[in-house]
């Protein structure tokens, strides 16, 4: 498919001249950021960004790659080096420590320097590192965490927790020996380490005692409370704040977000991770966009500003399943949340960053025609005289041999939301990838986001832009008209 | 491996504070660029950049990812959308048209707008688009093309040629019908379309009549001249310029580059593409770094400045073979050339861009330990109880079944320069990938390289920075002390 207007050199020359004009107009703001938002696409490497752009464009009846994601409109881009101290290819715990605390840690640890060792409780104390969210709270800002995973998951936990094992969601997950040594589960740390104004995502079951039925799935034991200590952490959290409210469904969330008496809001919409966007019950569970909007409504009441972490956390899960359909539709919802946040905030006073914690071994090749489905087949056949998809994985559960050979695939099969793209190596879960990821930036001090940087740089840019520790002497003018 | 200094949060905090300090000091130059250099890593997607960084670092006895490539030091980064008008995943012809001419074309065409159709000679005339190199020449600058492929290959051809088929290297490759319609082979266009001061790379055989023995391989007919028209294009080219010299080996190149009487230099060091760096005969063939240095020595004599295209063209070939060892060692040599060019030029007057034309379906995953070989095995075993490599391809010739199963692999096998990494789909040649690639920029107007851009933007930034057509009214101050 060749769009006729694109056959004319003038089309490209005009477009580039406009882009140049926009580039020349870019003026680094010398002011401080009142508000900070970090949008984290978990597992959203550059190949995921491009594929999602095409899919989002095609959902709007365009050919695809010529369209813009909301994140594409951010004026500044850098590359972020994602390795952890001990691994070339990291996990979401070590990376969260990097971009949220500004220090690199070890694989599967959270909020701890690399002096801490995975699963060794006694290496926790003294090695805690403090997140930018925590520093923002200390500076009088309101703070929030929004995610499509459980709120105790590795990425959001980087904002408030310190643990040698990212899997210690509730005390039932923590070995007795570690509990005796004083190591706390992540759910406990969520409500006790710091005062978080808005907490939205999944993870109900880690907050309630074992045997507590889940309000949405009372018939499923596996979805009920998991805690062994008998604590109802939601109740404990509610007791801390006069204006606190807990919600577990979309209707309650929308009501609470508009209620001026609500000062603190916890919404836990699934027992574990939230459902994929394509499986979401739209009456019961809010979308990431809706959660982001609700969070912004509450947080933006604070004249001192806010810090907000928004995670498209299940992009990663779709990739781990080698189901690109899930990963890419999650990426689109993540981008929709970015777009909505842009409408609800001003780049005059809000530094917004979009990045990924790591990438995936996910590729998009095979020379498909422009406008063809991102989930479709490559032109021609492979060496084995069978069709193959343009999307593929290096490793993962999509690998299967049928009668000692690679299975054939049809366009209708590959377009299915359940289809697992093939891989070179069979694994239970497809792995992360170690290449650099993009950082997109907009707002005050966004111009500092440049070149190739360590992932830790992200936390430092946020701290500096908002004059938070250790950059309180940031020497940046406050936004005209900001109040303290 | 956990470096003890990295266990301390101060290590990361200090490093990030320094990076912030550097970012704050970045001052967009308001001057024009006297010189333009575009470094093109053919097939050098972000996954290739990261893997090459680790390999280059490990060759210096470091752990790897914490080190810097020369391109990593460039202060500005953008992402480039590489699709061609007709394909989601492009080739090196259509992309060369984009980044060298500023207009997107169709798959496998070069220097033509998308109104031209692949292989249809009669769609050539009237659809030619003019490269920035051509415009630089018209503005009185010296110009050069350096590549590790044949100089008539798709990427360098984008600087000077217009053809509906990138494979028309010599007239022997052009169908008789197309020749009769007036379509010229690329080698002919190399010497006749414009005056190029420096031409260095491979591609001897396309310049000489059929039956002409190759000077380096006189006993191998397949390496001799291919031309059917009986022309000796080298002779024709030499006749055009008083100070022209032709060289075919490293010794002659080094001599010529230091000879002040040489005004034009053509060095063709192999009959076809140059050898992979790991196979190069260092007495006969120059490295990409040496060719780059030679080109800069000649071109920098012009007080009006120069345009130089430098291509690491065989990164792509290594990937097409699914031989990551070749692709990554080519990337390191490419980076060495960038480093050397940086030593020989000044960022005060030279805009240097580094980018790729497209990526490859190449991934780096599997959670390997820091410091482990980039060519090594992932920890643990796959579902089939066999080892697997951290580097893998989505598709390509590395796919093989042994007794109806995926072959096992050892560390010594995977570390071999000949080893082909496994892929999900068996193809004769691994394919390009369609995700965005990085653009690294340094020098005057480098700050315009920002955000997510169409690949065409690259050509326009170069033209604008040097006040070339269509940006002659660029309104940029010339560099202090520049002469005309």
């Amino acid at each position: 498919i060749i769009p006729v207007e694109e056959e004319n050199p003038d089309f490209w020359n005009r477009q580039a001249a406009e882009a140049l004009g926009a580039a020349k107009k870019l003026q680094p703001a010398q002011t401080a950021a009142k508000n900070l938002i970090i949008f984290l696409g978990d597992g959203m490497g550059v190949s995921t960004v491009t594929a999602a752009r095409i899919l989002k464009g095609q959902k709007k009846d365009k050919l695809g790659p010529e369209t813009f994601l909301a994140m594409d409109r951010f004026p500044y881009v850098a590359l972020s080096k994602t390795y952890s101290v001990d691994k070339h290819v990291p996990d979401s715990g070590a990376t969260a420590t990097a971009y949220l605390c500004g220090v690199k840690g070890n694989f599967q640890t959270i909020g701890l320097s690399a002096a801490a060792r995975f699963n060794q409780c006694n290496t926790t104390r003294g090695n805690e590192v403090i997140s930018v969210m925590n520093r923002a709270k200390k500076a009088g800002k309101s703070v929030g965490v929004v995610t499509t995973t459980r709120v105790q998951h590795a990425s959001p936990a980087g904002a408030y927790a310190h643990t040698v094992n990212r899997n210690w969601y509730s005390d039932a997950d923590v070995p007795a020996s570690a509990r005796q040594e004083g190591c706390q589960d992540i759910a406990t740390q969520l409500i006790s380490n710091m005062d978080i104004d808005v907490i939205l995502g999944g993870g109900r079951k880690y907050m309630f005692p074992m045997g507590t039925p889940d309000p949405e799935y009372p018939d499923d034991y596996s979805q009920g409370g998991t805690r062994l200590d008998g604590k109802n952490l939601v109740q404990e959290w509610l007791a801390k704040h006069q204006g606190a409210r807990y919600v577990w469904n979309r209707t309650e969330l929308l009501q609470a977000s508009l209620d001026p008496s609500v000062t603190h809001l916890m919404g836990l919409f699934e027992p574990g991770d939230m459902k994929y966007e394509i499986h979401r019950d739209s009456t019961l569970d809010p979308s990431l966009m809706e959660m982001t909007e609700a969070a912004l409504l509450l947080l933006s009441r604070n004249p001192r500003g806010f810090f907000l972490f928004v995670e498209g956390g299940r992009i990663d899960h779709g990739h781990h399943e080698s189901r690109a359909y899930r990963a890419l539709t999650e990426t689109i919802m993540f981008d929709d949340a970015i777009e909505r946040a842009g409408q609800l905030t001003s780049e005059e006073d809000t530094l917004s960053l979009v990045t990924a914690d790591h990438s995936h071994v996910f590729s998009f090749g095979g020379y498909p025609l422009r406008g063809s489905s991102i989930f479709g087949l490559a032109p021609g056949k492979a060496r084995d005289r069978k069709a193959y998809t343009v999307l593929l994985y290096g490793n993962g559960p999509g690998y299967v041999l049928k009668d000692g050979a690679r299975p054939d695939v049809t366009e209708s099969e590959s377009g299915s939301p359940e289809y697992r793209q093939q891989s070179a190596v069979p694994l239970d879960g497809e792995t992360h990838a170690g290449e650099d990821v993009a950082v997109f930036a907009r707002g005050p001090q966004a111009h500092l986001v440049h070149g190739v940087q360590e992932q830790t740089f992200i936390a430092h840019v946020m701290a500096f832009a908002a004059c938070l520790e250790p950059y309180t002497a940031c020497d940046l003018a406050p936004r005209a008209g900001t109040t303290d | 491996i956990i470096p003890v200094e990295e266990e301390n949060p101060d290590f990361w905090n200090r490093q990030a504070a320094e990076a912030l300090g550097a970012a704050k000091k970045l001052q967009p130059a308001q001057t024009a660029a006297k010189n333009l250099i575009i470094f093109l890593g053919d097939g050098m997607g972000v996954s290739t950049v990261t893997a090459a960084r680790i390999l280059k670092g490990q060759k210096k006895d470091k752990l790897g990812p914490e080190t810097f490539l020369a391109m990593d030091r460039f202060p500005y980064v953008a992402l480039s959308k590489t699709y061609s008008v007709d394909k989601h995943v492009p080739d090196s012809g259509a992309t060369a048209t984009a980044y060298l001419c500023g207009v997107k074309g169709n798959f496998q065409t070069i220097g033509l707008s998308a109104a031209a159709r692949f292989n249809q000679c009669n769609t050539t005339r009237g659809n030619e688009v003019i490269s920035v190199m051509n415009r630089a020449k018209k503005a009185g600058k010296s110009v050069g093309v350096v590549t590790t492929t044949r100089v008539q290959h798709a990427s360098p051809a984008g600087a000077y040629a217009h053809t509906v088929n990138r494979n028309w290297y010599s007239d022997a490759d052009v169908p008789a019908s197309a020749r009769q319609e007036g379509c010229q082979d690329i080698a002919t266009q190399l010497i006749s379309n414009m005056d190029i001061d420096v031409i260095l790379g491979g591609g001897r055989k396309y310049m000489f009549p059929m039956g002409t023995p190759d000077p380096e391989y006189p006993d191998d007919y397949s390496q001799g001249g291919t031309r059917l028209d009986g022309k000796n294009l080298v002779q024709e080219w030499l006749a055009k310029h008083q100070g022209a010299r032709y060289v075919w080996n490293r010794t002659e190149l080094l001599q010529a580059s230091l000879d002040p009487s040489v005004t034009h230099l053509m060095g063709l060091f192999e009959p076809g593409d140059m050898k992979y760096e790991i196979h190069r005969d260092s007495t006969l063939d120059p490295s990409l770094m040496e060719m780059t240095e030679a080109a800069l020595l000649l071109l920098s004599r012009n007080p009006r400045g120069f345009f130089l295209f430098v291509e690491g063209g065989r990164i792509d070939h290594g990937h097409h073979e699914s031989r990551a060892y070749r692709a990554l060692t080519e990337t390191i040599m490419f980076d060495d050339a960038i480093e050397r060019a940086g030593q020989l030029t000044s960022e005060e007057d030279t805009l240097s861009l580094v980018t790729a034309d497209h990526s490859h379906v190449f991934s780096f995953g599997g959670y390997p330990l820091r410091g482990s070989s980039i060519f090594g095995l992932a920890p643990g075993k796959a579902r089939d109880r066999k080892a697997y490599t951290v580097l893998l391809y989505g598709n390509g010739p590395g796919y093989v079944l042994k007794d109806g199963a995926r072959p096992d692999v050892t560390e010594s096998e995977s570390g071999s320069p000949e080893y082909r990494q496994q892929s999900a789909v068996p193809l004769d040649g691994e394919t390009h990938a369609g995700e965005d690639v990085a653009v690294f920029a340094r020098g005057p107007q480098a700050h315009l390289v920002h955000g997510v851009q169409e690949q065409t933007f690259i050509a326009h930034v170069m033209a604008f920075a040097a006040c070339l057509e269509p940006y002659t009214a660029c309104d940029l101050a010339p560099r202090a002390g520049t002469t005309d």
Partner: antibody
Framework: EVQLVESGGGLVQPGRSLRLSCTAS????????MSWFRQAPGKGLEWLAL??????????EYSASVKGRFTISRDNSKSILYLQMNSLKTEDTAVYYC??????????????WGQGTLVTVSS | DTQMTQSPSSLSASVGDRVTITCQAS??????IAWYQQKPGKAPKLLIH???SLQSGVPSRFSGSGSGRDYTFTISSLQPEDIATYYC????????FGQGTKLEIK
């Protein structure tokens, strides 16, 4: 409370057509994958057809045994699932069930079933 | 398409016995297996999903395990009310039932 009620079964001659309905209530119909199954007398359960939800474009899948003869569809305004059965054969005699998928652990498990409707194909 | 081979097809056991039913998939189904109980004239009833997750109201004597291609369903102590036909269902790739196991009391 989730409820699925099948209707439209009965006696039909070979070669004729029949349309089964499944009326859903107690949930947001458009958000869920729906399927048809059957069970021939004294035999096991067999999946026939699936229709996905709004978010995935209401795409359909069929088992090889009924592809081309049976068509699954849905009327979202009425929360009704249909199975159009053409060219019926005697071996299509079975109790037909509709079922709703729930995405527990991201798998489309069949958590809710109707009570079934009997289709008898006989001359 | 994924095939499911369930065994045994019928089983006679005494009250209090430990009963085991197995299902083997023709390819890896990534733990997406459910087990259903069906009594005559009734719709199937979900007991276990995702290999081992027990539905509420289902007695804890029912359990499931497995991974890859091989899965097991166990009744730790057979009760009279457990007389029924049991089916495995893979839902990784569309849906496929096992052939069923008819459980009888000796």
């Amino acid at each position: 409370e989730v409820q699925l009620v099948e209707s439209g079964g009965g006696l039909v001659q070979p070669g004729r057509s029949l349309r089964l309905s499944c009326t859903a209530s107690g949930f947001t119909f458009t958000d869920y994958y729906m399927s048809w199954f059957r069970q021939a007398p004294g035999k096991g359960l067999e999946w026939l057809a699936l229709i996905r939800n709004k978010a995935t474009g209401y795409t359909t899948e069929y088992s090889a045994s009924v592809k081309g003869r049976f068509t699954i569809s849905r009327d979202n305004s009425k929360s009704i699932l249909y199975l159009q059965m053409n060219s019926l054969k005697t071996e299509d005699t079975a109790v037909y069930y509709c079922a709703r998928a729930s995405f527990y652990y991201d798998g489309k498990v069949l958590a809710y079933w109707g009570q079934g409707t009997l289709v008898t194909v006989s001359s | 398409d994924t095939q499911m081979t369930q065994s045994p097809s019928s089983l006679s056991a005494s009250v209090g016995d430990r009963v085991t039913i197995t299902c083997q998939a023709s390819q890896d189904i990534n733990k997406y297996i459910a087990w259903y109980q069906q009594k005559p004239g009734k719709a199937p009833k979900l007991l276990i999903h995702y290999t081992s997750s027990l539905q509420s109201g289902v007695p804890s004597r029912f359990s499931g395990s497995g991974s890859g291609r091989d899965y097991t369903f166990t009744i730790s102590s057979l009760q009279p009310e457990d007389i029924a036909t049991y089916y495995c269902l893979q839902y990784d790739n569309l849906y496929t039932f096992g052939q069923g196991t008819k459980l009888e009391i000796k």
